[in-house]
């Protein structure tokens, strides 16, 4: 019989008492085969973290800073359940640390040196740790003691709780630096008042502070937020302009064998019976013998953290950077305006080889990082392990939802002004063999399908979106008799046609022979009835243009396109017979790397782009003999986006809406994780 006990870790006598009450009340409402609580008492949160890692306890609720400690080796804990605040309809699990300034003050984030600063308190998250952590490498050396470095960076500050004797500049704006509400500039409201009164130039607070202190929109409009990309935004745009997004209070567990489903089952039932306004005799979010015992008193309930989300993703790149800077205190030798090498994310073995050759030829401007799937690459770019990659539109959507931005677009048509003219897009088509003359768009049910990969534009999002509108359900593996859609569940009929061997079967990378445009077309040639690809795929792999044995004798005339009106047309008539127009593939990166990725890639394409004529003796960035490694092989150049510099603007309203509709069919664990951080 599996042990269904969750050992909760308590850090004080009062917590232990509440834990025992929690245990006893849960026993009274949950059947004997349901989850139960046991209580383990430790002296501190760090002791609780160690106990969970050592399998002496299972769960504890932590503030963000401790979630970071819990994640570090050898603890390796992960977030499993989040407390939420506000209403069930609009649950808030995160707050945003922001830098507020007056509208007319005219400086940016990179111009804070010499300004006057208002902090909620020394060592507090939004008011100190996050802003000082992010500014850490700009502080004058020596950076230890930290207070002295901060005092020398700003021209004056109010940092309540600082030592006014040793660091008088930190108390210049609030004599005495009192560590309670007796100091008018203490806490969130106090730091904002310090700015409002004109004592300081910038206040480091949380996003809600300004709304709590200024009910009137006209008053709020006198203030702006400083963004990390050295721009400013209105105060209500905090989701797009903040220093960090911080989880409020989180239950953590072991990454392996951590009982996360059991913990959720327990807490979900607990909130049903003892949540806000549920029971008089025991209340989960109330602490009669103290404050915030086990859970925050202000919490309204729990939400399950998506399983794909590790602590790094949950805490976010900015928060992790800030805390790591403060803890480790390491900075590059001397901060320069020089761009660091761009870490390109390569999918599996074949892309890695091409990336390595690029790295050697770039003489250190490009470095390579490997991952097994596109989603793993996106996650690595999010957390800073990698910087950039080129993505199909479907993954540009997921990357955008995860906070990444498009920076350059692949262009596929030769033109005099290639780099300045991003194209409208390419065509997603459905290809069939000419010999299967009875096959049309209207009778695909029960046929064998070939897809580039799950989540990609031409191979999945467009055809499956159209199909969903017809069949109104997501069971595509029942609609087709079998197929190859790399990235599907391995036991799905949509992996049955795939050709990868062993663990590589149906993997969404080049180890699966039917992956990508060329792979999906090969699947049609060898096994399938219909392939969902781009309009250039057939001509690129017929007429001897692909020398591989399976393709070398193929003739374009032996294939036709399915049109949405139920007719068929020759391959060259794609402009009048396609499923939809697809946005070109685009390079994505984090906002903080946007300028450098743009600059380095433009240099690289001038060296190794389409201007290189002999690819047998020279490195060519856009060639890999029909394998589309790192970039599509038909890329002519990488083009500037001009104002299409967000994923919504780049993909266009129509495509974003189409993918949004298909979201209910999404199997993307990364998309689920990212929409948890930003619904």
């Amino acid at each position: 019989v599996p042990d269904k006990t969750v050992r909760w870790c308590a850090v004080s006598e009062h917590e232990a008492t509440k834990c025992q009450s929690f245990r006893d009340h849960m026993k009274s409402v949950i059947p004997s085969d349901g989850p139960s609580v046991a209580c383990v008492k430790k002296a501190s949160y760090l002791d609780c973290i160690r106990a969970i890692a050592a399998n002496e306890a299972d769960a504890v609720t932590l503030d963000a800073g401790l979630v970071y400690d819990a994640y570090l080796a050898p603890n390796n804990l992960k977030p499993v359940v989040a407390e939420f605040y506000g209403s069930k309809e609009d649950p808030q699990t995160f707050y945003y640390a922001v830098a507020v300034v007056k509208k007319d003050s005219g400086f940016q984030m990179n111009q804070l040196r010499g300004k006057k600063s208002c902090h909620t308190g020394l060592g507090r998250s939004a008011g100190w740790n996050i802003p000082i952590g992010l500014l850490y490498c700009d502080l004058p050396e020596p950076r230890k003691p930290l207070e002295k470095a901060v005092a020398n960076f700003f021209s004056g500050s109010c940092a309540p709780c600082a030592d006014g004797t040793d660091f008088p500049q930190l108390c210049q704006l609030c004599p005495g630096c009192g560590c309670s509400t007796l100091n008018q500039y203490f806490g969130y409201s106090g730091a904002f008042k310090c700015l409002k009164d004109g004592a300081g130039d910038v206040a480091f607070v949380k996003h809600s502070t300004i709304f709590e202190n200024l009910a009137n929109k006209a008053d709020r409009d006198q203030y702006e937020l400083l963004c990390l990309d050295n721009t400013r935004k209105p105060v209500d745009e905090y989701k797009d302009c903040h220093l960090a997004q911080v989880p409020s209070h989180t239950v953590v567990a072991r990454s392996m064998g951590g009982k996360e489903d059991l913990i959720w089952e327990l807490l979900n039932q607990a909130q049903e019976h003892f949540g806000k306004d549920k029971s008089k005799e025991f209340q989960l979010f109330s602490s009669p013998h103290g404050k915030d015992l086990l859970f925050k008193d202000s919490a309204h309930g729990f939400l399950k953290v998506p399983p794909r989300m590790d602590a790094k993703m949950y805490l976010g790149y900015e928060y992790v950077t800030a805390i790591r800077n403060l803890r480790e205190g390491t900075c590059p030798e001397a901060p320069t305006d020089e761009c660091k090498p761009v870490k390109w994310c390569a999918l599996s073995h074949h892309e890695r080889l091409k990336c390595d050759e690029w790295s050697v030829n770039s003489v250190g401007k490009i470095e390579c990082v490997s991952a097994e799937t596109t989603e793993d690459c996106i996650a690595k770019i999010m957390n800073g392990e990698a910087d950039a990659m080129s993505l199909d539109g479907g993954f540009v959507y997921i990357a955008g939802k995860c906070g990444l931005v498009p920076v350059l677009a692949e262009n596929y048509n030769k033109s005099d002004n290639c780099e300045d003219t991003p194209e409208a897009g390419y065509f997603a088509i459905a290809v069939v063999k000419k010999s299967a003359s009875d096959l049309t768009w209207d009778n695909l049910k029960g046929k064998k399908s070939c897809h580039t990969a799950v989540g990609r534009t031409a191979g999945w999002n467009i055809p499956m979106g159209l199909l969903y509108n017809k069949i109104n359900h997501c069971r595509f593996d029942e609609f087709f008799s079998e197929g190859c859609a790399p990235g599907s569940k391995k036991d799905s009929s949509l992996c049955k046609l795939c050709m990868g061997s062993g663990l590589n079967l149906c993997e969404p990378n080049n180890k699966e022979g039917y992956y990508g445009y060329t792979g999906a077309f090969r699947c049609l040639v060898e096994k399938g009835d219909v392939a969902f690809v781009k309009h250039q795929t057939v001509p690129q792999n017929t007429g001897g243009k692909n020398p591989d044995p399976w393709a070398k004798n193929l003739n374009e005339k032996d294939y036709e396109l399915l049109c949405l009106d139920g007719t068929r047309k020759p391959v060259e008539e794609y402009a009048n017979c396609h499923l939809a127009r697809a946005p070109n593939h685009a390079v994505v990166t984090r906002k903080d790397k946007e300028a450098c990725v743009h600059k380095i890639l433009r240099q690289q394409q001038h060296l190794f782009g389409s201007n290189v004529t002999d690819c047998s003796g020279n490195f060519c960035l856009f060639r890999s003999e029909t394998k589309d490694l790192l970039f599509r092989d038909d890329t002519v150049c990488l083009a500037k986006l001009h104002d299409r510099n967000t994923y919504e603007k780049y993909l266009g309203e129509e495509y974003v809406k189409a993918v949004g509709n298909l979201r209910k069919c999404s199997t993307s664990s990364l998309l689920e994780a990212c929409t948890f951080r930003r619904p």
Epitope: L353, N361, N510
Partner: nanobody, 117 residues
Framework: EVQLVESGGGLVQPGGSLRLSCAAS????????MAWYRQAPGKGLELVSG???????NYRDSVKGRFTISRDNSKNTMYLQMNSLRAEDTAVYYC???????????WGQGTLVTVSS
């Protein structure tokens, strides 16, 4: 297609030196980029160093200042001079020419370098 054969490996003490050679059966003059990879026991393949046709070189951080890559087009050979060897340099070393454009799964026998006291 160019065939490559690695040699020069062996057992060496920490701090010692070795010179690896990679001999090509055809001309390497036209090959754009050549590289040395290594695979330590139980680990994945990693790029150690690469050299372009014009002689530009690149090294992974952990070997910078200790290893030197070179090529002699007239002898159809590439070299890796390894100095100040450390235990963590123990691996099978392979050379590759990238001429088959990335998706070949052919690797030679490699040459084993063991750094141990």
């Amino acid at each position: 297609e160019v065939q490559l054969v690695e040699s020069g490996g062996g057992l060496v003490q920490p701090g010692g030196s070795l010179r690896l050679s990679c001999a090509a059966s055809g001309s390497i003059f036209s090959i754009a980029t050549m590289a040395w990879y290594r695979q330590a026991p139980g680990k994945g393949l990693e790029l150690v160093s690469g050299i372009t046709r014009s002689g530009s070189t690149n090294y992974r951080d952990s070997v910078k200042g200790r290893f030197t890559i070179s090529r002699d087009n007239s002898k159809n050979t590439m070299y890796l001079q390894m100095n100040s060897l450390r235990a963590e340099d123990t691996a099978v070393y392979y050379c590759t020419d990238y001429s088959s454009r990335y998706y070949h799964d052919y690797w030679g026998q490699g040459t084993l370098v063991t750094v141990s006291s």
